[in-house]
């Protein structure tokens, strides 16, 4: 019988050089062999390119579109194929439904004295259009104690944040992640970075915990 | 190494049919759309058209009656075809590859002047 | 068809000087716009595509800007192999270029 489509596709870009269409079949498909999804630009004369899908579930499938650099223009049209048959037309402007890369290189630095210091990469290079408008989450918790989960809102532009080694507890391990948004093109959140786990040995100068002690 | 280069007469007669071969390496036809582009002595660029990679073509309005492209991906070839030369059309021809999604030319031929006279 | 016009048409400078050409188009064509560098004899190479986005393996002295009718090449310190000429190009079908700007040296 004729195959149907479930749930439209949905995608979401980069805003770099890919695209990724997640959407589902109507019944199992093994989407790399039967469908292909075609896309052009708009308005320029250019290529028709073909993404072969991959499964992404027993009824899922997802592509991921090449692109170059994204523009705020940019339209493009989607066709859904199974063989000769079309199951589904439509487009995609990737400016106006953005993911960001998620930030990478998260590293913490334990050896400033009273501070511990996350840095980590922003995940554009600088002519991108997102590079100077990505702001970012940090959140830290911890697998020694499970009541301590923070979410750090990072609203400055500098990939870093500074957290008084005082605030966490000594002698326990922390991790840390990092994701991206960018406001001004009304994104969704990145993915989490890979998670990073540091040993907090910070311990209060003995002054201070003899004044807690007695206090 | 991307390379491209345009190989074919360098001398035409007015109403005569100009054929000009694009040879490729580096890169696969099925992968890449292929541009011809000319320039006249002194003057500026001018795109002709276009084949694509799945081998559909886009043609420049001002030539579309008299211009063909085609492909054979086996031999690595582009070929343009050119009918009715005109002293007008004395002109180094360039083929240039499509870059990604986007019609400009990330890699050119170095070009073959053709010039077109009785 | 959308006309391509770039300005000046020649410009005399000296190595190490800031240069800014300028190409504006008869009709919005967003950020759909490339520059190349011809040399006498040679084939264009693309210096910038999107307006702005810097091709794979150019100097980063070379920049692009604007969008819509207005776009500029800006050569931020002038080196003896950037003379030459520069054509800009759109590409809202069918694709066009300018009629191009000499960079000679002063």
């Known amino acids: 019988g004729s195959m149907k489509v479930l749930q439209e596709p949905a995608c979401v870009s980069d805003y770099m050089s890919i695209s990724t269409c997640e959407w589902k079949m109507g019944g199992p498909t093994n989407c790399s062999a039967e469908l292909r999804l075609l896309y052009q630009l708009v308005f320029q004369s250019s290529e028709t390119h073909t993404c072969v899908p991959e499964n992404n579930g027993g009824v899922g499938c997802v592509c991921h579109l090449l692109m170059d650099d994204v523009v705020s223009m940019d339209n493009y049209t989607l066709d859904l194929w199974a063989g000769q048959q079309l199951l589904w037309k439509g487009s995609f402007k990737p400016s106006e439904h953005v993911k960001p890369r998620a930030p990478g290189n998260l590293t913490v630095h334990t050896n400033v004295s009273d501070t511990v210091l996350l840095t980590w990469s922003n995940p554009y290079p600088p002519d991108n259009y997102l590079y100077n408008d990505l702001t970012y989450a940090v959140n830290i918790w911890s697998e020694n104690d499970p009541a301590y989960s923070r979410i750090h809102n990072v609203t400055y532009l500098k990939p870093t944040l500074r957290i008084p080694a005082s605030t966490l507890k000594s002698g326990i391990s922390y991790r840390a992640r990092v994701r991206a948004w960018a406001q001004h093109y009304n994104t969704t959140w990145s993915e989490w970075s890979p998670s990073t786990k540091w040993y907090n040995s910070y311990r209060e100068p003995f002054e201070q915990r003899h004044h807690h002690h007695h206090h | 190494e991307v390379t491209l280069k345009e190989s074919g007469p360098v001398l035409v007669k007015p109403t005569e049919t100009l054929t000009l071969t694009c040879t490729v390496s580096g890169f696969s036809l099925t992968n890449y759309g292929v541009h011809w582009i000319r320039q006249p002595p002194g003057k500026a660029l001018e795109w002709l058209g276009v084949i694509w990679s799945g081998g559909s073509t886009d043609y420049n309005a001002a030539f579309k009656s008299r211009l063909t492209i085609s492909k054979d991906n086996s031999k690595s070839q582009v070929v343009l075809t050119m009918t009715n030369m005109d002293p007008v059309d004395t002109a180094t021809y360039y083929c240039a590859r499509n870059k990604g999604t986007r019609p400009v030319f990330d890699y050119w031929g170095q070009g073959t002047t053709v010039t077109v006279s009785s | 068809d959308i006309q391509m016009t770039q300005s000046p048409s020649s410009l005399s400078a000296s190595v190490g000087d800031r240069v800014t050409i300028t190409c504006r188009a008869s009709?919005?064509?967003?950020?759909?716009l490339a520059w190349y560098q011809q040399k006498p004899g040679k084939a264009p190479k693309l210096l910038i595509y999107n307006a702005k986005t810097l091709a794979e393996g150019v100097p980063s002295r070379f920049s692009g800007s604007g969008s819509g009718t207005d776009f500029t090449l800006t050569i931020s310190s002038l080196q003896p192999e950037d003379f030459a000429t520069y054509y800009c190009?759109?590409?809202?079908?069918?694709?066009?270029f300018g009629q191009g700007t000499k960079l000679e040296i002063k």
């Open positions: 009709e919005n064509i967003y950020s759909y």
């Open positions: 190009q759109h590409y809202v079908s069918p694709l066009t």
